[in-house]
């Protein structure tokens, strides 16, 4: 039942999680943990925020969005196969057992082997296409080669990301971005 996200070895993985603060600066503590959300708190915490700031993080895990506006999406830098698994985003809403909990499944795939350069690729390299991908970390701008290369790598990755981002669709379609207060 977890929402699934994908990345390749060596890329940055992006796991979305959002809430809407009741007022600007009126933040809610959030924790990210490796493993499904337990009943209370987060297990194996990799990053935590409090009412003011990120107060705990481990290497390679960071928040690239504006967490002060409720974007607490997790970026995992330079992923390896060992990063595969379920991650818990827990929005610690004040109250008794009132937290919002999201289990997100990260699937890491081996890096694609880039084929040897061809004459066509040499030609198009003089006119590189630019594609900015949001889904793999901090607005990485990647220079891409020929159209076949785009289709095989970036577009398929983006298509997978769009297809797999059921959480984002749910949030959009049902108005389920969490509003505090």
């Amino acid at each position: 039942s977890e929402v699934e996200y994908r990345a390749e070895v060596g890329q940055n993985a992006y796991l979305p999680c959002f809430y809407t603060p009741a007022a600007p600066g009126n933040l809610v503590p959030v924790c990210w943990g490796k493993g499904a959300c337990p009943v209370f708190e987060c297990g194996n915490v990799v990053l935590r925020t409090d009412e003011r700031d990120v107060n705990y993080w481990t290497s390679r895990y960071w928040l690239n969005g504006d967490f002060r506006k409720g974007d607490v999406s997790l970026t995992i830098e330079n992923v390896t196969l060992a990063d595969s698994g379920i991650y818990c985003c827990r929005i610690q809403i004040p109250g008794i057992m009132n937290d919002e909990k999201f289990n997100l499944k990260l699937v890491i795939k081996p890096a694609k082997v880039t084929p040897a350069p061809t004459r066509q690729r040499d030609f198009t390299a003089a006119f590189p296409r630019m594609l900015t991908t949001r889904g793999h970390g901090p607005a990485e701008t990647q220079t891409l080669g020929s159209l076949p290369d785009i289709n095989l790598t970036q577009i398929s990755t983006l298509a997978n990301e769009l297809r797999d981002s059921r959480l984002a669709n749910d949030l959009r379609d049902s108005g389920a971005t969490i509003r505090i207060g």
Epitope: S1, C37, V39, I96, N98, E100, F102, I178
Partner: antibody
Framework: QVQLQESGPGLVKPSETLSLTCTAS????????INWVRQPPGKGLEWIGW????????KYNPSLKSRATLSTDKSKNQASLNLDSVSAADTAIYFC??????WGKGSTVTVSS | DIQMTQSPSSLSASVGDRVTITCKAS??????LGWFQQKPGKAPKTLIY???RLVDGVPSRFSGSGSGQDYTFTISSLQPEDIATYYC?????????FGPGTKVDIK
């Protein structure tokens, strides 16, 4: 706004199964805990169990001796409680709650032949 | 299971009085204690969580304190609308357990 509504038969015969449904709205159903609590007439509150609709995890009050089963239907934003082999002692108002902060109005169930 | 004892079981006080209810857990519950107000025919309403944190919108005359096994709920100045039964709840571990309740009325 967050709303929960319990529904089910008001009268159940002894030894039968009590079935209640809790319909939730106003929030992301799969991301929040649901608790069930009951209150016999003129008595205090008793916790029945907990379910997390996101993955179906459950916890139960051992005092119910495995008679309770909690489940969810995510497509309908509904949580369900089944209580087997009921007796007069199960007569109560049954509440569902999101976490324990937002409660339904309660559903009165009488066990009688 | 963690047992919760609550006292008194009932009390009568005058409008404006300070009212105190205590709740004791059979073991340390790490401040995972809530207080609820229930009026006849209504669902319980959360007033306090984590022992001393007031739920948004709840009047400031309600307060909670305590740690470990011993907790206190206070109404600093009793109002007519505060007539209700008050319950404590431990949510440190399953099964969750409520205190038996304290019925508060006006003299």
């Amino acid at each position: 706004q967050v709303q929960l509504q319990e529904s089910g038969p008001g009268l159940v015969k002894p030894s039968e199964t009590l079935s209640l449904t809790c319909t939730a709205s106003g929030y992301t159903f799969t991301s929040s805990d649901i608790n069930w609590v009951r209150q016999p007439p003129g008595k205090g509150l008793e916790w029945i169990g907990w379910i997390f609709p996101g993955d179906g995890s459950t916890k139960y009050n051992p005092s119910l001796k495995s008679r309770a089963t909690l489940s969810t239907d995510k497509s309908k934003n509904q949580a369900s409680l089944n209580l087997d082999s009921v007796s007069a002692a199960d007569t109560a108002i049954y509440f569902c709650a999101r976490g324990l902060d937002y409660w339904g109005k309660g559903s009165t169930v009488t066990v009688s032949s | 299971d963690i047992q919760m004892t609550q006292s008194p079981s009932s009390l009568s006080a005058s409008v404006g009085d300070r009212v105190t209810i205590t709740c004791k857990a059979s073991q340390d519950i790490n401040s995972y204690l809530g207080w609820f107000q229930q009026k006849p025919g209504k669902a319980p309403k959360t007033l306090i969580y984590r022992a001393d944190r007031l739920v948004d919108g709840v009047p400031s005359r309600f307060s909670g304190s305590g740690s470990g096994q011993d907790y206190t709920f206070t109404i600093s100045s009793l109002q007519p609308e505060d007539i209700a039964t008050y319950y404590c709840l431990q949510y440190d571990e399953f099964p969750l357990t409520f205190g038996p309740g304290t019925k508060v009325d006006i003299k």
